[in-house]
């Protein structure tokens, strides 16, 4: 369940965060899951731990792998898994899939195109970008921040694009390129007050103490690209991250997914270890565009444990 | 509410409305406007648990709503006023479970009058 799919090329930086989320406070330490042998932290190995953070510095073939990540906090342990593959460098412009995250989609009112996992990288501007292995030129391409805007977007533009660019590691430079695809939309799309599919307006839902316990917030909010759309829970009106109890995170679903033509949104509430207190909180599902915001309200309530009869 | 008055097109206000008798989490809390003659129209909005906001078509870019949870305040700043937004300006409170500038609110002030001349 937490476990994240990673890859990279050989002799390029690799940085992989760990799917469990935990306070910065909180040490994590890092393993082989085949050897369960300790990953340094030393930053003279090429490959080390930092935090939250794996670093391949380059990666090798070799480092393919699964790696244990263990979020360790004085009050409990949270496991994660990142399965990672270091692929050959390829000789032709062809982009095999396994190298490619998420599609985007684009229109004449929103082209942007986010370069993938440079978050997690000590990278400074500008990137460069390609498409089809082409270097980007023309004054209707800009490469601004972490992404890459087109001007005037036609049906032209759809097709492989890479963001390369430079991470930086006590004074020492890697290179780590990132392709996705981009597709144009023809339609033209529109936008919705946001309609929230799942949970029903004031649910039950019925868990168990001591289990883990899933809500999904879903919410579509038109048809095409959109521009600002969000779903997000909160606990007693308090962001998650501000609520303070590591016990209940939430993570994104499906990036957006067009069901029926629809834009939708998915966002994951997971509670581990449900507890009484549990019970006493609303736990609000917010559904916001530029239209408005819609929320929709879950309360937990104790499922019976199952009376057998003899 | 307070803060209305008379002032030029191109001018500013800022109006700031008590809300104390107001739960302030959870809630939505916005502006509408009324002309003489004209329906009741909505602002602006928020949504106090998280400070989201939303406008109408007609003020975006222009009015900006924020809140002061210490103070229990809710503010509109009013930038480059245009006689057409002359009017009723109320505070208003408690839209259930949707927030936007258009919402209807459940609960309101006494209003305070913004006249924009040209």
């Known amino acids: 369940k937490f476990s994240k799919q990673s890859w990279g090329l050989e002799n390029e930086a690799l940085i992989v965060r760990c799917p469990r989320q935990g306070k910065p406070s909180y040490t994590v330490d890092w393993y082989y899951s085949q050897t369960n042998k300790s990953i340094p932290t030393q930053e003279r190995n090429r490959v080390f731990a930092s935090g939250q953070l794996l670093k391949f510095l380059p990666a090798a073939v070799a480092d393919s792998g699964i790696y244990t990540c263990i979020v360790r906090s004085p009050t409990f342990n949270r496991t994660g898994y990142a399965n990672v593959t270091i692929y050959k460098k390829q000789s032709d412009c062809n982009v095999p899939d396994y190298l490619m995250y998420s599609t985007v989609s684009g229109s004449e009112k929103n082209s942007k195109i986010y370069c993938p996992t440079i978050d997690l990288y000590n990278w400074t501007a500008p990137l460069e970008w390609f498409k089809n292995c082409q270097a980007l030129q023309g004054s209707r391409y800009r490469a601004h921040k972490s992404f890459l805007v087109i001007d005037n977007v036609m049906t032209e533009d759809a097709g492989d694009y890479t963001c390369k660019f430079i991470h930086n590691e006590n004074g020492a430079n890697y290179s780590v390129t990132a392709t996705r695809s981009f597709t144009v939309k023809d339609e033209q799309g529109f936008s919705l007050f946001p309609v929230i599919g799942a949970p029903a307006q004031n649910e039950i839902k019925e868990v168990e103490i001591g289990k883990n316990a899933n809500l999904t917030c879903s919410a579509c909010f038109g048809k095409g690209t959109q521009f600002l759309a969000a779903v997000l829970w909160q606990l007693n009106g308090t962001k998650i991250t501000d609520f303070g109890e590591p016990r209940i995170q939430q993570e994104e679903g499906q990036n957006q997914s067009f069901s029926n033509g629809l834009a939708c949104l998915d966002m994951v509430l997971r509670i581990a270890d449900v507890k009484e207190e549990d019970l006493l909180l609303q736990y609000d599902c917010l559904a916001l565009n530029l239209h408005g915001l819609r929320r929709h309200t879950v309360r937990l309530s104790r499922k019976n444990p199952s009376k057998e009869c003899f | 509410e307070s803060g209305g008055g008379s002032v030029q097109a191109g001018g500013s206000l800022r109006l700031s409305c008590a809300t104390s008798?107001?739960?302030?989490?959870?809630?939505?809390m916005g502006w509408f406007r009324q002309a003489p003659g004209k329906e009741r129209e909505g602002v602006a909005a928020i949504y106090t648990s998280g400070g989201f906001t939303f406008y109408a078509d007609s003020v975006k870019g222009r009015f900006t709503i924020s809140q002061d949870n210490a103070k229990n305040t809710l503010y509109l700043q009013m930038n480059t006023l245009k006689p057409e937004d002359t009017g009723i300006y109320y505070c208003?409170?408690?839209?259930?479970?949707?927030?936007?500038?258009?919402?209807?609110?459940?609960?309101w002030g006494q209003g305070t009058q913004v006249t924009v001349s040209s």
């Open positions: 008798g107001v739960t302030y989490r959870r809630t939505c």
């Open positions: 208003a409170a408690e839209a259930g479970d949707e927030c936007s500038a258009s919402s209807v609110f459940r609960s």
